[in-house]
């Protein structure tokens, strides 16, 4: 078979403090940086990041909550608890963009799932969401 | 309508499988006229650690 | 490692209807879709369709609407394109690609149609 | 229907050239393209996503870059298993559309 596959986002969103601006290879801004292809759902959990102007991306940091293959690393051994959450948007049409994170539809719903999951979550032990994928209802 | 699956992480001992689906049940309606979603059919399940994230979407669908 | 393997080579009458299959393995991943392409003798790539696996989730190039069908099989990890009412100018490599996070991610190895009387 | 315009269509070039392939999009269509390498005996492979995200197990000789609506595959330096067939894809909206190839020769 050829080619290699790629890894539906997986994006820790998190309200931290401290920020910082970097600057994204493509001319056209992605609000969430797209991640290392190597498997249909990597672990890698990025930092959130809101859409600034034309050529740069906006970051809050967060711990680094990353992993090399598909399980979690072994510093999250203790200490964090995840869920697994499903449920629909019945008032949005699934089309085959949601399936790639570079499309303008795909960074817009991931976004506002992100900016809602801050909302609800406002305690402080939330922290942030990864391994999101959207399918057809 | 499209489906959406992922994963929430919180400090241990914060929340449980209760209480992350009643919050989120809880804010269903501000997500409607805030981000024009209307959601239904909320799902949440613990996730066993040490997870795989491929493994653990796989499972769910 | 992932692999997409086609179903082999036909050879079909004007009129008639071919359907080639497309079967993933080495994910037993089921979510995800497929897009078909084709390439006719000595041309481009075209894109005729896409499916996601499971669901009944189509989406077509108005080019095909009415001759193509595009369905799957999730337990047999298999989708299926059929085109109908074939032509000649119909002859081509058909080949599925599946998605991995990303579009287009996985090709499969084609499938050549022959269309003659 | 968005129109990929590649170029050349086909080049001619020896072992250790740089090589550059473009595609000019009719359409805005962000970064949402990918560049594919068909080989002689028709198997094809995506080497870049995303306009400049390279697949794994490519080659880094390889590199996807943009400049507007141009969007540009380059090979640093050509190998012998690289002579082969190159075409552009856009999924910014359907329906998908290729550019038309450029056909890498030996010289």
């Known amino acids: 078979a050829s080619g290699s596959a790629s890894g539906s986002a997986s994006t820790l969103v998190h309200n931290g403090t401290s920020a910082r601006a970097t600057t994204t290879p493509a001319s056209k801004s992605t609000p969430f940086s797209i991640p290392s292809h190597h498997s249909d759902t990597p672990t890698t959990l990025a930092s959130h990041s809101t859409k600034t102007d034309a050529s740069s991306t906006h970051h809050s940091s967060v711990p680094p909550l990353t992993s090399s293959n598909h399980s979690t690393s072994p510093q999250l051994s203790t200490g964090v608890s995840f869920f697994f959450l499903s449920f629909h948007i019945s008032n949005l049409q699934f089309n085959s963009s949601l399936e790639d994170p570079s499309t303008d539809y795909y960074q817009e719903l991931q976004r506002d799932i992100s900016e809602m999951f801050l909302q609800i979550y406002k305690q402080g032990g939330f922290l942030g969401l990864s391994n999101i994928k959207f399918r057809p209802g | 309508s499209v489906v959406v699956q992922l994963t929430l992480a919180f400090r241990e001992g914060t929340i449980n499988v209760h209480d992350v689906e009643t919050q989120f049940n809880q804010y269903k309606t501000e997500a409607a006229s805030r981000y024009n979603l209307t959601i239904s059919d909320v799902s949440v399940s613990d996730v066993p650690f040490p997870f795989s994230a491929q493994s653990h979407h796989h499972h769910h669908h | 490692e992932v692999q997409l393997v086609q179903s082999g080579a036909e050879v079909k009458k004007p009129g008639a209807s071919v359907k080639v299959s497309c079967k993933a393995s080495?994910?037993?991943?089921?979510?995800?879709?497929i897009n078909w392409v084709r390439q006719r003798p000595g041309q481009g790539l075209e894109w005729i369709g896409y499916?996601?696996?499971?669901?009944?989730?189509?989406e077509y190039n108005e080019k095909f609407k009415g001759r193509v069908t595009l369905t799957s099989d999730t337990s047999a990890s298999t989708a299926y394109m059929e085109l109908s009412s074939l032509r000649s100018e119909d002859t081509a490599v058909y080949y599925c690609?599946?998605?991995?996070?990303?579009?287009?991610?996985?090709w499969g190895q084609g499938t050549l149609v022959t269309v003659s009387s | 229907d968005i129109q990929l315009t590649q170029s050349p269509s086909s080049l001619s070039a020896s072992v250790g050239d740089r090589v550059t392939i473009t595609c000019r999009a009719s359409?805005?269509?962000?970064?949402?393209l990918n560049w594919l390498q068909q080989e002689p005996g028709g198997a094809i492979k995506r080497l870049i996503y995303a306009t400049s995200s390279l697949d794994s197990g490519v080659p880094k000789r390889f590199s996807g870059s943009r400049s507007g609506s141009d969007y540009t595959l380059t090979i640093s330096s050509l190998q012998p298993e690289d002579f082969a067939t190159y075409y552009c894809?856009?999924?910014?909206?359907?329906?998908?559309?290729f550019g038309g190839g450029t056909k890498v020769e030996i010289k």
């Open positions: 894809l856009q999924y910014a909206s359907s329906p998908y559309t």
């Open positions: 080495g994910y037993t991943f089921t979510s995800y879709g």
């Open positions: 499916i996601y696996l499971g669901s009944d989730y189509t």
């Open positions: 359409q805005d269509i962000g970064i949402t």
């Open positions: 690609a599946r998605s991995a996070g990303s579009l287009f991610a996985y």
